[in-house]
């Protein structure tokens, strides 16, 4: 009879064991274990009748199609075999054990005691068959195994071979190299690779297989396993396989598909090809005169680009447009996209106008081309060049006039200061009551007219000032303070200020320059009670042109002592001291109660202590501060207070040979102007030099040399 056994282990004994087995007996045990296991069988006891080739009694171990062993007897002999310590292993998951005894037993035989167990199959070690073994990696586990792939590979649906995903390769460059996956290592199995070469229309792809060509083939059938096919439009070239590479292929197309197929077996190294775009050839190029073309090649094909550039000092000229470089391209029809441009010498064109300056050409014919030279100079004697610049500019390769120091910036013509077009008279003798000033004697003298239209009737008053530069007037703060009804210090509105320069005779304004104010700046510490810090600036709306009758005065050096006692200075003014004279009358026809023509006087600086004492002795709260100095004569006289408020008290500076504004007409009194010991009080300008430069937005060092030369 047959016994079916399905357990993972078990025991099999001869019938009646441990007693002797009966005669004429046959039992079959069919052992089945799960797939992935084999059966291990061994005997703990074995005692059967001996016979030649185990013809009588035996134990036969077999699989479905194979006898694994036949045992009988007690000891192994030449013709019979006992299991002894031997282990029987089934190749698969099934084992059949048959026990048979014949009709007679001469002795009493005890039979056998056997054990079996399911043991794991290590498929990774034992699979010899390529059709079944893992392509890359094999992993055993109890009862089975699985395969995996190297990085970049994908396990095929057969769970054994490793393929690659290679159906999405696009090549758009004009040249390139394409290989089978993992080249030169064997290419993956079970793969469908697609390579697309897609170039711009006008190019044609040429293919060339290189190096190794090794694709699995067949001796009789053309490329049944692995192959390359090349698809050009509707046309298919190939299949190609084996060890001989195809000849170079000229596809005559800008679009090519390469298909590579591999089946699930074989170990071949694959292939490598290079492709190159071919295009129409364009005609040879000649570089322009004074120029070059890059890159320089013997031949140029479709899509080649050439950059045309010119030598230093020349510019590319194309269709009357100047440029640094020009690019042309070889077109698909074998023509160039443009004609070669010409190289034209750089032209800096007419140099920029220099305010208050002149230009002279150093090059003949007033040339303005590359390397030409010009020289800027200032309108002397009214202006001089800042930092004593050479003024020489050369036409650069960039097409701009360049100076070694200033680069492309133009030089600056600074107004010369303190140098009247007429020499001021000798300061030896005193001028009683003032005298007429010749035109150009006080070219810095400004008449400041303030018309406050915020009151009804409009309030008008005037003062004098001194020109410091083409755009700035220095004056006294009290002239430009809004005549508010309280004691606040607020500047007048700039719209209410008019400045007259170059004015000599108030009846004749035709030669004068009148300018509006862009800014009115009072000294922040001006004190309305005692006139301390009585200094202010007016910035003109437009710079005034300098000339013989309009020139700035120089600022002094920063020196707290101010002008030395007994030094002689000059003050100019129209002597407008009559309170009944209106500004309208001053600016229009003039009136006989004042001088139509600018007057000036010579006054000595009064020692500070003497002046302080003279004012302290008076009734009233007079304060002569360190920001003031006095000038005038002890015995008085009209000349002492001829100057108009804000006018400049100038002293000749021997060092620089220029006239310097040391004071501004500020106050005096309370007695009648010109009374004995009534000195005029002036703002000490040397205390405010830094403040003035700061307001004018110029560093002191820039202009200082005007005075210290």
């Amino acid at each position: 009879h047959t016994v079916e056994l399905n357990n993972m282990f078990g025991q099999i004994q001869s019938p009646g064991y441990p007693d002797s087995y009966p005669s004429d007996s046959e039992v079959t045990w069919n052992i089945t274990v799960p797939d992935g296991f084999r059966i291990k069988l061994y005997f703990m006891h074995f005692n059967l009748e001996s016979s030649y080739l185990c013809e009588y009694d035996y134990v036969k171990v077999e699989t479905e199609d194979q006898v694994l062993a036949t045992f009988c007897g007690r000891e192994t002999t030449d013709t019979e075999q006992t299991p002894g310590q031997e282990v029987v292993l089934s190749p698969g998951s099934f084992m059949s054990i048959t026990f048979r005894s014949d009709f007679s037993n001469e002795e009493r035989f005890t039979g056998f005691d056997a054990h079996y167990m399911a043991v794991d199959v290590d498929e990774c070690k034992e699979r010899e068959d390529e059709e079944l073994s893992c392509d890359h990696y094999c992993h055993n586990y109890i009862g089975g195994y699985y395969c995996s792939c190297r990085f970049g590979y994908i396990l095929h649906t057969d769970n054994r071979t490793c393929r690659v995903e290679c159906s999405d390769n696009l090549f758009t460059q004009r040249t390139g190299v394409i290989t089978s996956p993992d080249f030169p290592n064997p290419y993956p199995k079970s793969s469908e690779c697609l390579y697309t070469i897609e170039l711009e229309e006008g190019f044609m792809v040429n293919l060339q297989f290189e190096d190794i060509f090794d694709i699995e083939d067949h001796p009789e059938v053309p490329c049944p396993y692995d192959y390359i096919k090349i698809k050009v439009g509707p046309k298919v070239l190939g299949p190609f396989c084996g060890e001989k590479a195809p000849e170079p292929i000229s596809t005559q197309s800008h679009s090519v598909l390469i298909l590579f197929h591999s089946d699930n077996s074989g170990e071949n190294r694959g292939w490598r090809l290079s492709y190159r775009a071919a295009g129409n050839e364009c005609p040879e190029l000649q570089p322009p005169v004074h120029g070059k073309i890059e890159p320089s090649q013997a031949k140029y094909f479709f899509k080649d680009q050439v950059l045309v550039s010119c030598d230093t000092g020349y510019k590319v000229l194309k269709d009357n447009v100047e440029m640094d470089t020009f690019q042309i391209e070889c077109l698909k029809d074998g023509t160039w996209s443009n004609k070669i441009p010409t190289c034209k010498i750089v032209d800096c064109r007419a140099p920029g106008e220099l305010e208050h300056g002149l230009i002279t050409f150093s090059t003949r014919n007033n040339l303005t081309t590359y390397k030409s030279e010009i020289k800027y100079s200032c309108q002397e004697p009214y202006y001089k060049m800042l930092n004593n610049n050479t003024g020489i500019y050369t036409c650069s390769a960039q097409g701009v006039w360049m100076n070694k120091v200033l680069g492309r910036s133009l030089p600056t013509c600074l107004p010369e200061c303190g140098q009247p077009s007429r020499s001021l008279p000798s300061l030896v003798k005193r001028i009683i009551g003032g005298r007429n000033a010749e035109p150009g004697l006080f070219p810095w003298q400004a008449l400041i007219v303030v018309e406050d239209t915020s009151r009804v009737p409009n309030d008008k008053w005037f003062g004098s000032g001194a020109l410091l530069s083409a755009s700035w007037i220095l004056t006294a703060a009290h002239v430009l303070r809004s005549q508010r009804r309280d004691t606040t210090v607020i500047p007048v509105s700039k719209e209410h200020v008019t400045v007259y320069l170059g004015l000599h005779d108030v009846r004749d304004k035709s030669g004068a320059v009148n300018s509006s104010a862009a800014r009115v700046v009072l000294h922040p510490d001006f004190n309305i009670q005692n006139y301390n810090h009585d200094i202010a600036l007016v910035q003109l709306q437009e710079p005034v042109p300098l000339g013989p009758h309009v020139m700035p005065v120089c600022l002094p050096r920063l020196e707290p002592e101010g002008p030395a006692p007994h030094m002689l200075g000059l003050v100019a003014g129209w002597g407008i001291s009559n309170p009944n004279v209106t500004v309208d009358e001053i600016i229009s026809s003039g009136t006989r109660t004042l001088s139509d023509v600018l007057q000036y006087v010579k006054l000595p600086v009064v020692p500070h202590a003497e002046c302080k004492t003279s004012y302290e002795s008076r009734s009233g709260n007079y304060s002569v501060t360190e920001n003031m100095f006095c000038a005038g004569y002890y015995e008085g006289g009209k000349d002492t207070c001829l100057g108009d408020s804000g006018g400049a008290f100038v002293i000749f500076d021997d060092l620089s040979q220029r006239w310097v504004v040391q004071g501004l007409v500020s106050w005096g009194g309370p007695e009648e102007c010109g009374s004995k010991q009534v000195y005029g009080v002036y703002t000490k300008v040397s205390n405010y030099v830094d403040w003035v430069w700061e307001q004018m937005g110029l560093p002191q060092s820039v202009v200082e040399p005007q005075v210290e030369r």
Epitope: S454, R455, V456, W461, G463, Q483, P579
Partner: antibody, heavy 113, light 112 residues
Framework: QVQLVQSGAEVKKPGASVKVSCKAS????????IEWVRQAPGQGLEWIGE????????DYNERFKDRATFTADTSTSTAYMELSSLRSEDTAVYYC??????WGQGTLVTVSS | DIVMTQSPDSLAVSLGERATINCKSS????????????LAWYQQKPGQPPKLLIY???TRESGVPDRFSGSGSGTDFTLTISSLQAEDVAVYYC????????FGGGTKVEIK
Amino acid sequence: QVQLVQSGAEVKKPGASVKVSCKASGYTFTGKWIEWVRQAPGQGLEWIGEILPGSGSTDYNERFKDRATFTADTSTSTAYMELSSLRSEDTAVYYCVRSEDLWGQGTLVTVSS
Amino acid sequence: DIVMTQSPDSLAVSLGERATINCKSSQSLLNSVTRKTYLAWYQQKPGQPPKLLIYWASTRESGVPDRFSGSGSGTDFTLTISSLQAEDVAVYYCKQSYTLPTFGGGTKVEIK
């Protein structure tokens, strides 16, 4: 023509505030000072203060500094004077004046409990 | 504050006669910068706002009859009506605007 037109008469309780308006026409409002002057019944003139509409600058009589506020709306060419913490002695006709020459018709403010 | 003292308080003058009103300031009204004296004279008739007659001590406002004149300097000022007319009956005020303005107490002019 050039004129200043003031708002109508007001009756206020002590401690309240009053705001008098003055609409200018016929000239550039922003460029001229507007003064405020008052006159108590049967009394003389008293200067309260002034405003320059274009800049908003103001000057106040020290006596009114804490109670009077001047403002100006340049879009409507109107000046305003607000007087707070009113008392019976503030009963007066309040005038707005363009600088010194042109006077409004006056606004009577009566302060009474 | 500058104090303005007007005299007399009232004045009765015959038609066609001269009327003189005085005004004294507690300090000089001459501005040394503008060289102007900031004193004005006003006329106020009953139920009307004041009217500007004279500014800068002596300058007559346009449209004001020339019988009105102003004089004086420093601290002493005078308004003169050279020939009094019936329509000149009013209260007259002086005003300084050298600093924050102040008015005089007023002078009532009547016909005798």
